[in-house]
């Protein structure tokens, strides 16, 4: 025997109090599938949340965040403060990226610049707080005779070619020094990160999943370290 409730479409519920008649969902509730015995209460977007999509009898409301915040969590169950590019969110609010790191978004953490030398390339454009370094061709590609087909060079005075050679050597030396400096810098940063992990701690952690996304929900109330409430420090 077929369940009479299975005939009730989305936007209705099977009303046991009225001989299993299909009744429309009451205001501020919905049923997204047929055959439901109750309608679910619509989500309400309050506080830092704002309504992105109104609730209807067949679909739930959808929330997003007020300006200056972005969604986190499934279905935007939490909002996190935006920062500027070149910054990351910490316990104390938005802080500039440390030297050697960058963030090109309004959310997330500062990431280390690409180490061009690891790919045997050279730094073409230096990194900033907002942008990663741009890696160029490897130093070998820049050296004379590296290209298999070279157009005949116009005849020049001996003095001129000496100037070009000196300039090239100076540039190569500078590049090598820069690469050595950057490599050393990253080694030191790695050592500091290992030795003093608390310096690099984010304000708020997601507790599930392998890749822990780091977010700022809130810090505890400073005056209640031993017990009491938690509070958000911007």
């Amino acid at each position: 025997l077929q369940d009479p409730c299975s005939n009730c479409p989305a936007g209705t519920f099977c009303d046991n109090n009225r001989n299993q008649i299909c009744s429309p969902c009451p205001p501020n509730s919905f049923s997204s599938a047929g055959g439901q015995r109750t309608c679910d209460i619509c989500r309400q977007c309050k506080g830092v949340f704002r309504t992105r999509k109104e609730c209807s009898s067949t679909s739930n409301a959808e929330c997003d965040c007020t300006p200056g915040f972005h969604c986190l969590g499934a279905g935007c169950s939490m909002c996190e403060q935006d920062c500027k590019q070149g910054q990351e969110l910490t316990k104390k609010g938005c802080k500039d990226c440390c030297f050697g790191t960058f963030n090109d978004q309004k959310r997330g953490i500062c990431r280390p610049w690409t180490n061009c030398s690891l790919d045997g390339k050279s730094v073409l454009v230096n990194g900033t707080k907002e942008r990663d370094v741009v890696c160029g061709p490897s130093p070998a590609d820049l050296s004379p005779g590296a290209s298999s087909v070279t157009p005949p060079a116009p005849a020049r005075e001996p003095g001129h070619s000496l100037q070009v050679l000196t300039l090239f050597l100076a540039l190569t030396s500078a590049l090598l020094l820069a690469l050595i400096f950057i490599t050393l810098l990253f080694s030191v940063l790695k050592w500091i990160r290992k030795k003093f992990p608390h310096i690099f701690k984010q304000p708020f952690k997601k507790t599930t999943g392998a890749a822990q996304e780091e977010d700022a929900c809130s810090c505890r109330c400073p005056q209640e370290e031993e017990g009491g409430g938690g509070g958000y420090e911007l």
Epitope: R43, V48, C217, G229
Partner: antibody, heavy 118, light 107 residues
């Protein structure tokens, strides 16, 4: 430092009203909402209502007819008033700050213990 | 109203153990759930919001999980200071509602 300090009477007679003031420091009422939650003796927590940073209020339907929440941003005070008290309104009343990231309570006042008795 | 059910009123555990406090919503609330700890004689303290995001300063032995209707607060390596009552709360819709609480007893 973030603090919510409550002041109010400990004993109220039946049918009288309850007034509690929640004075906040370390944050602004123009940025954060403040909720009111109560806890009857030996029982769980019950949400009563909230006043948002823009001054709008939302109340639990079960209390809407006898509850009023107002605030004064300049003095950083939130005022809670509940009328027509009965014995079953005996509880600890808390003010709590709304988290900036969701609709939850990230910092709580110390609580005001209310006894409704003649 | 959305009813949050914490079926276990009391749970007994020993220091160093792992314990899971459960909470069931009467309808799908996505991940709009927070958890609180209330030590005896104190105000509640926020532990978790958005079902699985830990508040800063909360020890990482506290883990939140779940979505839809079933939610869990797991405390691994239980410490004596974890003796408290734990409440879940939904913020999907008004009225905001709490579970009835689960009291954690340390043997």
């Amino acid at each position: 430092q973030v603090q919510l300090k409550q002041s109010g009477p400990g004993l109220v007679q039946p049918s009288q009203s309850l007034s509690i003031t929640c004075t906040v420091s370390g944050f602004s009422l123009t940025t954060y909402g403040v909720h009111w939650v109560r806890q009857p003796p030996g029982k769980g927590l019950e949400w009563l209502g909230v006043i948002w940073s823009d001054g709008n209020t939302d109340y639990n339907d079960a209390f809407i007819s006898r509850l009023s929440i107002t605030k004064d941003n300049s003095t950083s005070q939130v005022f809670f008033k509940m009328n027509g008290l009965q014995a079953d309104d005996t509880a600890i009343y808390y003010c709590a700050r709304n988290s900036i990231t969701s609709v939850s309570f990230d910092c709580w006042g110390q609580g005001t213990t209310l006894t409704v008795s003649s | 109203d959305i009813v949050m059910t914490q079926s276990q009123k009391f749970m007994s555990t020993s220091v160093g153990d792992r314990v899971s406090v459960t909470c069931k919503a009467s309808q799908n609330v996505g991940t709009t759930v927070a958890w609180y700890q209330q030590r005896p004689g104190q105000s509640p303290k926020a532990l978790i919001c958005s079902a699985s995001y830990r508040y800063s300063g909360v020890p990482d032995r506290f883990t939140g999980s779940g979505s839809g209707t079933d939610f869990t607060l797991t405390i691994s390596n239980v410490q004596s200071e974890d003796l408290a009552e734990y409440f879940c709360q939904q913020y999907n819709s008004y009225p905001l509602t709490f579970g009835s609480g689960t009291k954690l007893e340390i043997k």
